[in-house]
Structure formats: C-alpha cells, structure tokens
Amino acid sequence: ESALITQQDLAPQQRAAPQQKRSSPSEGLCPPGHHISEDGRDCISCKYGQDYSTHWNDLLFCLRCTRCDSGEVELSPCTTTRNTVCQCEEGTFREEDSPEMCRKCRTGCPRGMVKVGDCTPWSDIECVHKESGTKHSGEVPAVEETVTSSPGTPASPCSLSG
C-alpha cells in the first residue's frame, strides 16, 4: 500500500475527508511517513503538510511540521517523511547558540580589519585584522561595506522534548 497521501487526497474541499491510509506494522514498527495506531495493530499515514515521521517508529502520533518564522524562507516543504526546511533570509543568519531566531548580519568590518567571509544563513561576516590576520567577533562594526548571503544548509528540525 502506498505510504504517502496523494495530491488527490488533499483536495477539493467539498469531498469527504479521506480515510488515513493503513498498513500493518513490521516487527512492531511503522515505516517513515506513518505512526502506529492506539492498539498497535495498524500503521496510519501522517497527514501531508501537517505532520511527519522520518524513521521506522512506534510513535503513537506523527510529529508536527515546522512553520517557518517571519524572517525565514522555506527551502523545502514538509512531507510525510521529512520536516519543513527553513533558512534565514538574505542578510540574516542563525547562530548555533541562539538557533531560535535569525539575526542581522553586520554590514561591514571595524576599522583596521578586512572581511574574509561573507554573511551566510548560518554565519555572520568574518573579519580579520589587516596585519595579524586574527579573527574578530565584535558586535559594533563601522559601516564600510555591505554583504550578501549565499544559500546554505538548512536548520535542523526541532526535537520533541522542546
């Protein structure tokens, strides 16, 4: 039986909502794109665009799809087997130690420093001292040059334990 709910299943709205697709667990587990039923005897398909599961599992429900925040762009939509992939908009980045929000990239390096790395969706511009070549992570730049971001790696999906 097909694991995914097809486009037909999602519309038109006047049709009765389709039954979620079912199959039997294999060794107690359901395939990606499914969760296990309350009695553990069926695998129930996740709802396309609403929830997902990425691995063989015995979860009693599928995981909610992430919604990209304002300030983020959707790189790829949520499917039944993969969460939404969101990325910071151009000119902003997400730091590892504050992954909950995109921050504006600095527009230039402080005096006496040169830019060696562009603003990307996952890092601010990188500045080094002209002479020594040592990195600088100061927060208050002089506006000397603007930078643009290049496409980058996606943010990882949130974990259950929130």
Partner: antibody
Framework: QVQLVQSGAEVKKPGASVKVSCKAS????????MNWMKQSPGKSLEWIGR????????FYNQKFKGKATLTVDKSTSTAYMELSSLRSEDTAVYFC???????????????WGQGTLVTVSS | DIVMTQSPLSLPVTPGEPASISCRSS???????????LHWYLQKPGQSPQLLIY???NRFSGVPDRFSGSGSGTDFTLKISRVEAEDVGVYYC?????????FGPGTKVEIK
C-alpha cells in the same frame, strides 16, 4: 526529580462539576502523555484516558467519554481533568500518571500523582 | 474489555519468607507484535501506586531484585523472594495489550 503534584480534596453536590489539576515538574512536560485513573473506595483502578501535551490529542476509555474532559496548560506544565454531572458513583480518588509516547513503552505509568479525593454528596 | 483476576485477594506473609501472586487475563495478552504488555504496581498504604514490573518481567528502576515477574499468554506471576516489612500494600496487575487498559482487583499483602 520527576514529580506530579495534584490539587486538594473536593466535596461536590450531585450534578456539579469538578476540575482536578496535576502539576508536573522535573521533566519535559510535552515529552510524555498524561493519563488519569480512578480508584473508587475499596476498589481497583480504572484508566480514564490520556492527554498528549505535544499536539493536544486526547484518547479516552469509552466508559468515561462525556464524563471526563482532559486538558493541559503547557505554560504551567499542568494537566487538568474535569468531571461533569457528578453522581455518587464518581466519588473516588483520581490519579494522574505519566506514560511514554511510544506504543511499546507507553502502556504503563512510571510516575503517579499523590491522588485527589473527590466526594460527591448531597 | 479485558478482565483481569488476581489470587489470592489477601496474602498474609512472614518477613524473610517468599510470596507469590497470580494474575489471569480473560484473553491472551500476547500482542500481534509478539510482546506481552502485562505490568505490576504496588500501592503502599496511604500512597499512590508505584510501578514495579513492566512487560511481564522487567523491573522498573530502583525496584529491588527480590521482585520478579514471569508468565505468558493469560497466566502471570509476581514473586517476592524474601518479603520485607516495607513490601506491604496492595499489588495490582495491569494490561495494555488491549484498549482500554485494565487493572486487576488487587492483592493485599500484610505481615502475619
């Protein structure tokens, strides 16, 4: 450490409603089901149902549908059970209990609240 | 619903001696996935139940190894190898193979 602390005893008149609370601490509240059990005086335990704090789903024992309503307040990590149209047979100690989100490990309660006595008397 | 029965309903014990409680279900508790979802709880006087054994024979963390569970199908046993004074209370078996989950009537263990 994991703790489930329930609200105090209640005395209610027949026909009234009561709302029992269960405040969770020491673990990620949205990471586990919250179940409710009934223990009538001198009797065994009955499973009422469970609430999924992650997505808001409820799953009830058919016997308690229409009698119990399960909710949570995620901001305070508190689960609630409201019992409506109370009758004398609803007099019991009610327990909350935590269970896992997985079928294979989700059918038993690893931590319990201390219990709340609800007495229905005219 | 699955009916769980326990015997005896009352069990006077001597500290240091072994004790055994039987639990039977009205239908097999072997799930189609091959696992058996039979659990044991102890409710000490004035307290809430506490998990002792899950899935027939697995001791929950912190449970002393004098407690052991066994059985299959519809017949299950909880054994205490050497009863201690702190083991008094009501022991319940419970099943989660079939919805709704159900409990046995309990076995009251008391010191002779």
């Amino acid at each position: 450490q994991v703790q489930l602390v329930q609200s105090g005893a209640e005395v209610k008149k027949p026909g009234a409603s009561v709302k029992v609370s269960c405040k969770a601490s020491g673990y990620s509240f949205i990471g586990y089901f919250m179940n409710w059990m009934k223990q009538s005086p001198g009797k065994s335990l009955e499973w009422i149902g469970r609430f999924n704090p992650y997505n808001g789903d409820t799953f009830y024992n058919q016997k308690f549908k229409g009698k119990a309503t399960l909710t949570v307040d995620k901001s305070t990590s508190t689960a609630y059970m409201e019992l409506s149209s109370l009758r004398s047979e609803d007099t019991a100690v009610y327990f909350c209990g935590r269970s896992a989100y997985y079928f294979d490990s989700g059918g038993y309660f690893d931590y319990w609240g201390q219990g709340t006595l609800v007495t229905v008397s005219s | 619903d699955i009916v769980m029965t326990q015997s005896p309903l009352s069990l006077p014990v001597t500290p240091g001696e072994p004790a055994s409680i039987s639990c039977r279900s009205s239908q097999s508790l072997v799930h189609s996935n091959g696992n058996t979802y039979l659990h044991w709880y102890l409710q000490k006087p004035g307290q809430s139940p506490q998990l002792l054994i899950y899935k027939v024979s697995n001791r929950f963390s912190g449970v002393p190894d004098r407690f052991s569970g066994s059985g299959s199908g519809t017949d299950f046993t909880l054994k205490i190898s050497r009863v201690e004074a702190e083991d008094v209370g009501v022991y319940y078996c419970s099943q989660s193979t079939h919805v709704p989950w159900t409990f046995g009537p309990g076995t009251k263990v008391e010191i002779k």
